[in-house]
Amino acid sequence: AYRPSETLCGGELVDTLQFVCGDRGFYFSRPASRVSRRSRGIVEECCFRSCDLALLETYCATPAKSE
């Protein structure tokens, strides 16, 4: 189970992103429009530091707009 704040690396990070983002998919670097001063890429953020659910969700792709 995903723990609130931890280091996530390798396949565990990929699997966690797939779980959190579901059908939306995800980016390993945030798209330009969503870049913040902290945009180091998710491996850098989660593996070399630590990350929480909120941070993981910022790497999910934007859901397609429905009519």
């Epitope: 280091t7 690396c9 396949g11 990929v14 491996v43």
Partner: antibody, heavy 120, light 107 residues
């Protein structure tokens, strides 16, 4: 072609330090993480740590924490691994190896290895 | 840390034989398992990643399977150049860990 070229063999005394270099060519140096792996004579492979050549961030195996330092020089596309307080059981071949992607899919390009011998 | 246990540690086989090497993880690693081949005096070469994905240039006689904790490397028809040591490695979580190796020798 994609290549990692390591520095030459070293002979060190116990307690000394060694610094091994690994020069990358044939690809964008800052786009791939770099691992260091060692292999004692006749033994298996042991992962030591990883460096992000882009930002310089590192993560080390607990066993080497406090004794190993990994650095990089983007101007020469070179990563370095320094191991201090050497002991006889640090005698090994040290390899740098490029990560495939996202730290999830192995190491696809390896240096030729650097033999480090620790002996009094 | 995740422990990787390889078996057998060595085996003797003849050219043309089908060879199977197994690797077991101490906890589930999904499909994040890589296989390497190492010849004496050389660096390892990545053969297979993600449990079953053959690397470019690797002969199709090599195949990998498994997920969770149990994985297999199969050489369908052993060739003279395949006599080497094979290592598995998990890339599920840090620290990355390797199996102890399987040395494939000529019978």
């Amino acid at each position: 072609q994609v290549q990692l070229v390591q520095s030459g063999a070293e002979v060190k005394k116990p307690g000394a330090s060694v610094k091994v270099s690994c020069k990358a060519s044939g690809y964008t140096f800052t786009s791939y993480y770099m691992h260091w792996v060692r292999q004692a004579p006749g033994q298996g492979l042991e992962w030591m740590g990883i460096i992000n050549p882009s930002g310089g961030s590192t993560s080390y195996a607990q066993k080497f924490q406090g004794r190993v330092t990994m650095t990089r020089d983007t101007s020469t596309s070179t990563v370095y691994m320094e191991l201090s307080r050497l002991r006889s059981d640090d005698t090994a071949v040290y390899y740098c190896a490029r990560d495939v992607q996202w730290l999830a899919y192995g190491m696809d390009v390896w240096g030729q290895g650097t033999t480090v011998t620790v002996s009094s | 840390d995740i422990q990787m246990t390889q078996s057998p540690s060595s085996l003797s086989a003849s050219v043309g034989d089908r060879v199977t090497i197994t690797c077991r993880a101490s906890q589930s690693i999904s499909s994040y398992l890589n296989w390497y081949q190492q010849k004496p005096g050389r660096a390892p070469d990545l053969l297979i990643n993600a449990a079953s994905s053959l690397q470019s240039g690797v002969p199709s006689r090599f195949s990998g399977s498994g997920s969770g904790t149990d994985f297999t490397l199969t050489i369908s028809s052993l060739q003279p150049e395949d006599f080497a040591t094979y290592f598995c490695q998990q890339s599920y979580s840090l620290p990355f860990t390797f199996g102890g190796g399987t040395k494939v020798e000529i019978k």
